[in-house]
């Protein structure tokens, strides 16, 4: 019986040819959706010129079709027993799914403007910058597209430097027809309990953003965990889209198209400031802004961004500092719609169903030598936009999950 | 090999107008900041001001900002400082130093020409 | 504006000796400090720029360290042809100033 079970359970986990789990690990049989909402700013003239509060409406959502695209340069290594990938990127914007359409215009922070005179602090080069900006009639907010927001466009203050500048900006950019990785993961062959843990990113076990143990690349990359999954667990996984790994928690039993899950989150501890979660100490990398690292909720990941200021941090600042948030008007976070989750039968520890919810925010700071910036009292973490990336097992896997694994065992 | 050839030494009575030049060649000379130095006999160096080519954007000392004048000329590859209203205390040995622009961090004044001796003299 | 105050003035040395000169800045610069040598009749000439960076062909018995504002500038083993004037620079802010200078001499 149970042992039967287990037993081809473990046969159907491994990551090599002719497996159920390897079929769909290729190219996921679920539909994932990534739906955007872009924090349009109410009052940019008054935040220029008086250091006012950020006045934000969000607008979306905005939907796209993501991870439609097959893995790449599948390759397996039978001498350590991993398989190496890329994961294409693609996105295929969804109008019945959206409120609007990708020509949509909002108002949002001028991304070469702030990350420029971030990366950029000695006076001379800010003087320099300033006659660029004021020449290009650039200023501190501007008018994108969605899709200029999104996938990039032609910066006039940026094409007014000359090589070695990228003038190209987007949240983004580039990202249609660019892959993830090389990701190198573990098919489980010789050992079950390493199947689809990360054995190496980019050729590195470290990523070499962070200090001591916050800079390792721990578990999977949370499509998948190993098999026979048990409540007490904390499920490590790689995320490269914030520049870490975290961890999510049990958080209770679901009923999912009649297959029993659990439901796993990323608990506020995770994002907790070092006075309140020691083991956080070396996502803390600068004094200033983090409030000698008494903030919390947000991650500044400009190290993996090539010095541009960008923050990661939940939708609406959920779990953040009220110091964080304060500067923002418009924000109502709630756990419900802001957190992220995993549905994980234990069984298989495959991941039928989650929600990756976060939020893309640019520091802004108060610059003597740009015009632009020079009216700032403060620095200001500015929501750009949150995103809401989500996958549920279509009804016909989830019958044939149902006949061959849970109705099996039940 | 990165070369800034300056003009000449300059004898000019108070009151009078001067304008030196600075002649670059060995690299793309709208790709780096052209800064200029003042050093009194006998004194300390001072920095007067600087100009990036690509643009013509120019960041002044105050001190200089009604004496010296900043200006290049592309196509000849060529940084000028014109003084004006020149005094006893203009006397001096005034140098042109360029820097490639691209990133914090970077050195400062890393090319010198050779310098320009200016004297004030009735 | 941000003042450099550099000391000695001058001093004398005999030849393997080491010589340390002190830049010290009215305002918080970080490590954008730069120092310079001037030889009698030539241009000065740039040793160690920002973040205590040795420039290429520079000998490495050149160093300098400090942070914030109290910057050290060290020769170790002193030769005949490091007589010259020293500056130091700091690129933090504008206007960019220098340190009044040190007479290097060999007894």
């Known amino acids: 019986g149970d042992l039967l079970i287990q037993k081809t359970i473990k046969k159907q986990v491994v990551l090599e040819e002719g497996t159920i789990a390897f079929k769909n690990w290729v190219k996921t049989g679920t539909e994932v959706y990534r739906q955007f909402w872009i924090f349009d700013v109410q009052n940019p003239q008054e935040v220029m010129m008086n250091s006012s509060n950020i006045q934000v409406k969000q607008r979306g959502p905005y939907t796209y079709r993501v991870r439609f695209l097959a893995k790449e340069n599948v390759t397996q290594d039978a001498e350590d027993n991993t398989v190496s990938f890329l994961q294409p990127n693609g996105a295929i914007f969804e109008p019945s799914l959206s409120v609007g359409t990708e020509a949509d215009n909002f108002t949002v922070l001028n991304l070469a403007v702030a990350a420029a005179s971030h990366i950029y602090q000695n006076q001379f080069v800010q003087m320099i910058l300033n006659s660029l900006i004021n020449k290009s009639k650039s200023s501190m907010f501007q008018v994108r597209t969605l899709r200029e927001l999104l996938w990039g466009y032609r910066d006039p203050f940026l094409s007014l430097v000359p090589y070695p500048v990228t003038t190209t900006v987007g949240l983004f950019y580039p990202y249609n027809n660019t892959a993830d990785g090389v990701y190198k993961v573990f098919n489980g062959k010789d050992n079950i309990s390493k199947v689809a843990i990360i054995d190496t990113y980019k050729g590195k076990r470290n990523l070499s953003y962070w200090e001591s143990h916050c800079d390792m690349i721990n578990g999977t990359d949370a499509a998948s965990f190993p098999p026979f999954v048990e409540k007490s667990q904390v499920l490590q996984f790689f995320s490269s889209d914030i520049c870490r790994s975290i961890y999510a928690v049990f958080e209770s039993d679901v009923n999912l198209k009649g297959i029993p899950v659990y439901r796993f989150v990323l608990p506020s501890k995770a994002f907790a400031s070092p006075v309140e979660n020691p083991d956080n100490y070396c996502f803390c990398t600068e004094k200033i802004i983090s409030k000698n690292c008494t903030s919390y909720g947000v991650l500044d990941i400009s190290k993996c961004k090539e010095g541009r200021p960008v923050y990661i941090s939940l939708p609406h600042f959920l779990y953040a500092s009220p110091d964080v948030s304060e500067p923002i008007d418009g924000l109502n976070p709630n756990e419900e719609e802001h957190r992220t989750y995993l549905d994980i039968e234990p069984i298989t520890g495959f991941t039928l169903q989650f929600a990756k919810r976060l939020q893309v925010n640019l520091l802004v700071k108060p610059s003597e030598k740009i015009q632009v910036l020079k009216n700032l009292k403060r620095n200001y973490i500015v929501p750009i936009l949150w995103l809401n990336e989500t996958g549920t097992i279509g009804d016909e896997k989830a019958n044939m999950f149902r006949s061959q694994v849970t109705g099996k065992i039940n | 090999e990165v070369q800034l050839q300056q003009s000449g030494p300059e004898l000019v009575k108070p009151g009078a107008s001067v304008k030196i030049s600075c002649k670059t060649s060995g690299y793309t000379f709208t790709e780096y900041t052209m800064h200029w130095v003042k050093q009194s006999h006998g004194k300390s160096l001072e920095w007067i001001g600087g100009?990036?080519?690509?643009?013509?954007?120019?960041a002044y000392n105050q001190k200089f900002k009604n004496k010296a004048t900043l200006t290049v000329d592309i196509s000849s590859n060529t940084a000028y400082m014109a003084l004006r209203s020149l005094a006893s205390d203009d006397s001096a040995v005034y140098y042109c130093?360029?820097?490639?622009?691209?990133?914090?961090?970077?050195?400062?004044?890393?090319?010198w020409g050779q310098g320009t001796l200016v004297t004030v003299s009735a | 504006e941000t003042t450099v105050t550099q000391s000695p003035a001058s001093l004398s040395v005999a030849t393997g000796e080491k010589v340390t000169i002190r830049c010290i800045t009215s305002t918080d610069i970080d490590d954008d400090m730069n120092w310079y040598q001037q030889r009698p009749g030539e241009p000065p000439n740039l040793l160690i720029s920002e973040g205590n960076t040795l420039r290429p062909g520079v000998p490495s018995r050149f160093s300098s360290s400090g942070y914030g504002t109290d910057f050290v500038f060290t020769i170790e083993n002193t030769l005949s042809e490091d007589v010259a004037d020293y500056y130091c620079l700091q690129s933090d802010n504008l206007p960019f100033t220098f340190g009044s200078g040190t007479r290097l001499e060999i007894k």
């Open positions: 130093a360029s820097d490639y622009f691209y990133g914090d961090g970077y050195p400062w004044f890393t090319y």
């Open positions: 100009i990036y080519p690509y643009n013509g954007g120019t």
